[in-house]
C-alpha cells in the first residue's frame, strides 16, 4: 500500500512537558508508517 | 487494506452512558497512536482524544470539553480502540471518527437527547 | 489553546483556475527540530475527512500534485493550481503539536 506519510523525519521523538517542548511525533506512529515497517521480528538467536 | 470501522453510537438520554468501538485492520496496530475527533451536525471537526502506544505506556490526553466523563482506551490483541461515554451531554451530539491522522473511519452517530 | 483561524470561511471556484486557502495559527507551530505541525484535510460531502497535506507541505500519497501546501510558522497556505469539481468540499487546517489538538473552522469550496 502507498504510504500517505513519508519518514524523512524517523528520528523525531515526542518530549511531553511544557508545550515548546512537545514534537509532531505523529508521522512516525502513523498507520502509513506502520505498513511501510511492518511488524519488525525478534533477531534470530545465534 | 486499512480499514477503520466504528461501532456503538445511538440514541441516549441526557446523563446516559455509551461505549464506541473501533476496529481496526490492514496494518500493525500496536505501535500506532489512535484519536477521537467528533463533529456536531453542520459544524466543523473537534479533536476529543488520544491514546498513544504500549511503548509510551498507553498515555492518554483528552479536550477539556470531555475530560472526567470520557475514557480512551486500547486493547492491542483486538487491534480496536474505545471511547467511554459517561454523563452525556445533549452538545455531545455528533458523529464520532476513529482516527490515525492518515486514515479515518466512516464515523458513528451519537444523539444525546431527552 | 492554539486558535487556528482561516480565510475565507467560503470559496467559489472555476474549474481550472487556480485557488487558495489561508491558514494562520495563534503561536507558532514550527518545533524544535525543523518540522511544522500544519496539516490539511479535505471532508467532501457525506464523507469523512481525507489527509491532503502534513507538516505544512507534504503531499500524502495518493493526493493529485495540483495540492501544495506552504507557509511560515503561523502562517499558512493551501494552493490548488487547477480547481476539479471533485475538489468540492470542506478544507481544514489542523495543528497536532499542543494538546488540545484544534482545527481551523474550515472553508467551503464550491463551484461558481
Known amino acids: 500500500l502507498a504510504d500517505p506519510l513519508d519518514h524523512r523525519d524517523a528520528g523525531d521523538l515526542w518530549f511531553p512537558g511544557e508545550s515548546e517542548s512537545f514534537e509532531d511525533a505523529h508521522v512516525e506512529h502513523s498507520i502509513s508508517r506502520s505498513l511501510l515497517e511492518g511488524e519488525i521480528p525478534f533477531p534470530p538467536t545465534s | 487494506e486499512v480499514q477503520l470501522v466504528e461501532s456503538g453510537g445511538g440514541l441516549v438520554q441526557p446523563g446516559g452512558s455509551l461505549k464506541l468501538s473501533c476496529a481496526t485492520s490492514?496494518?500493525?496496530?500496536?505501535?500506532?497512536?489512535m484519536h477521537w475527533v467528533r463533529q456536531a451536525s453542520g459544524k466543523g471537526l473537534e479533536w476529543i482524544a488520544h491514546?498513544?502506544?504500549?511503548?509510551?505506556?498507553?498515555?492518554?490526553y483528552y479536550a477539556e470539553s470531555v475530560k472526567g466523563r470520557f475514557t480512551i482506551s486500547r486493547d492491542d490483541s483486538k487491534t480496536t480502540i474505545y471511547l467511554q461515554m459517561n454523563s452525556l451531554k445533549t452538545e455531545d451530539t455528533a458523529v464520532y471518527y476513529c482516527?490515525?491522522?492518515?486514515?479515518w473511519g466512516q464515523g458513528t452517530t451519537v444523539t444525546v437527547s431527552s | 489553546d492554539v486558535v487556528m483561524t482561516q480565510s475565507p470561511l467560503s470559496l467559489p471556484v472555476t474549474p481550472g483556475e487556480p485557488a487558495s486557502i489561508s491558514c494562520r495559527s495563534s503561536?507558532?507551530?514550527?518545533?524544535?527540530?525543523?518540522?511544522?505541525?500544519l496539516y490539511w484535510y479535505l471532508q467532501k460531502p457525506g464523507q469523512s475527512p481525507q489527509l491532503l497535506i502534513y507538516?505544512?507541505?507534504n503531499l500524502a500519497s495518493g493526493v493529485p500534485d495540483r495540492f501544495s501546501g506552504s507557509g511560515s510558522g503561523t502562517d499558512f497556505t493551501l494552493k490548488i493550481s487547477r480547481v476539479e469539481a471533485e475538489d468540492v468540499g470542506v478544507y481544514y487546517c489542523?495543528?497536532?503539536?499542543?494538546?488540545?489538538?484544534?482545527f481551523g473552522p474550515g472553508t467551503k469550496v464550491e463551484i461558481k
Open positions: 490492514g496494518f500493525p496496530f500496536s505501535n500506532v497512536w
Open positions: 491514546i498513544k502506544a504500549k511503548s509510551d505506556n498507553y498515555a492518554t
Open positions: 507538516r505544512m507541505s
Open positions: 489542523a495543528q497536532f503539536l499542543v494538546y488540545p489538538y484544534t
Open positions: 503561536r507558532s507551530l514550527l518545533t524544535s527540530k525543523g518540522i511544522t505541525s
Open positions: 482516527t490515525g491522522l492518515d486514515y
